[in-house]
Structure formats: C-alpha cells, structure tokens
C-alpha cells in the first residue's frame, strides 16, 4: 500500500453533507495576531 502526502490543487468535495464547501475560498482578511 502507498501513503500519499498529496499535492496542492483545486478540488471537489464528494460528500454533500460534510459541512465544508467544495473548494473553500480564501478568507479576504487576516485576524489580528
């Protein structure tokens, strides 16, 4: 078996009720600290 550490890319979520968006947008502001 092979363990993968993956890549960084856009992706799609296959489970509709995970509570997470298919490809979350980057937040436009940073919290202080």
């Amino acid at each position: 078996s092979e363990t993968t550490t993956g890549t960084s890319s856009n992706s799609s979520q296959s489970t509709s009720n995970s509570g997470l968006a298919p490809n979350p947008t980057n937040a436009t502001t940073k919290a202080a600290g």
Epitope: T4, T5, G6, T7, S8, S9, N10, S11, S12, Q13, S14, T15, N17, S18, G19, L20, A21, P22, P24, T25, N26, A27, T28, T29
Partner: antibody
Framework: EVNLEESGGGLVQPGGSMEFSCVAS????????MNWVRQSPEKGLEWVAQ??????????RYVESVKGRFSISRDDSKSSVYLQMNNLRAEDSGIYYC??????WGQGTTLTVSS | DVVMTQTPLTLSVTIGQPASISCKSS???????????LNWLLQRPGQSPKRLIY???KLDSGVPDRFTGSGSGTDFTLKISRVEAEDLGVYYC?????????FGGGTKLEIK
Amino acid sequence: EVNLEESGGGLVQPGGSMEFSCVASGLTFSDHWMNWVRQSPEKGLEWVAQIQLKSDNYAIRYVESVKGRFSISRDDSKSSVYLQMNNLRAEDSGIYYCTTGTDYWGQGTTLTVSS
Amino acid sequence: DVVMTQTPLTLSVTIGQPASISCKSSQSLLYSNGKTYLNWLLQRPGQSPKRLIYLVSKLDSGVPDRFTGSGSGTDFTLKISRVEAEDLGVYYCIQGTHFPYTFGGGTKLEIK
C-alpha cells in the same frame, strides 16, 4: 456506525517530533476528505490540516501556523490518515481530533509539548 | 481569517425553557453555489465534539427537532425550544465556506 480512532499522543520536548495516526471504520474512507483539528484552553478549537481525495490529486491544505512543520498523509488501503509533526512548539499542545469534515469526529489524542 | 463570534459565553437555563445562541461571522458565509456552510457542534463534558446542524439549518440524523438553526450571510442562531439535561455542554459554530475553517469561541450551556 462510523468510528475514527486516533493514536500516537504523548509528551515531547520543544523542537521534537510526533506522528498521529487515525484509522476509520464504518464508512467508505476513500470518499471522504480527512482533517485534523486541535483543541486547547488557549486557542479553543482550531482546524489544522486537510487531505482530499485521489480524484482531487490528494490536495492538501494547512493552517498557516503549521505550514512547513506538519505533514498530512493518507493511505486509503488502510483507511488511515496521518499527521507528522516536526519542530514542535509549546503552542502545539492540545487534543488532536481526526475528522471527516464537520460530521464525524474521533475521540481525540493528547499532545503535550514541554521541557 | 474569518472571525466567528459567539454570544453569550455562558447560558444558564432551566430544564424545559428555551435557549438561544448567536454566531456572527466577519465575512459572509454564502458560497458561490448558493449554499451557506455554517455548522453547529455540541461538545459534552469529557467527549469529542458532535455535529448537530449543517448548512445553517439541516439537522443531523438522531438530533432532536427541538434544535433549530437559522440565519444567513453573517448572522446565525441556534435555538433549543425546550432544554433537556442531555443538552448541557459547549456549543460551537464552525464555518466551512472560507479557508482556513474557523470556529466560534463556544457557548457553555449550564442547567439551572
């Protein structure tokens, strides 16, 4: 019934390393994004890392504070996800949960970073 | 990062009475597909978090219908119509629209 079981917690000195494992049962593991979330009295609940599906080229995301130090991986044949943590800091201490998203959570495993 | 602000910090409620928790986000949680990825979790003492509600108002399997989620944009509410003893614990909101995913600070529900 879905079950996520973490292992690998313990005490480590600052600058040290630790690896967590999480094995899933009761679900089609390869169909689920997998995440690590941590909880501490100081920071509350904090999402740490995510690895997506083979069909997503196993895309990975990290919270900024762990980039370059933590590495998430998965082995679909073993229904397992891993979190390798290096150069640990005191602020990394807490309970680490394996989660599928927001829906299923493991029981948590505790990391203490202290000299 | 998207800041999730929960109020109140602590809620002391008599069994059988209603309870309401507010969660406000620093940015809209409406995603481009028209869905809003706002979830509510309950962490009972000594346990891991358990999800109650996803997509603002959808109840997870086995969650009693005395729980109701509502809201849109940046303003969300979790209501319990009649609090029961098993409802005690800490309630968290978490947004899954923006990266990184962020949690509210929690609201501790105590039974009077």
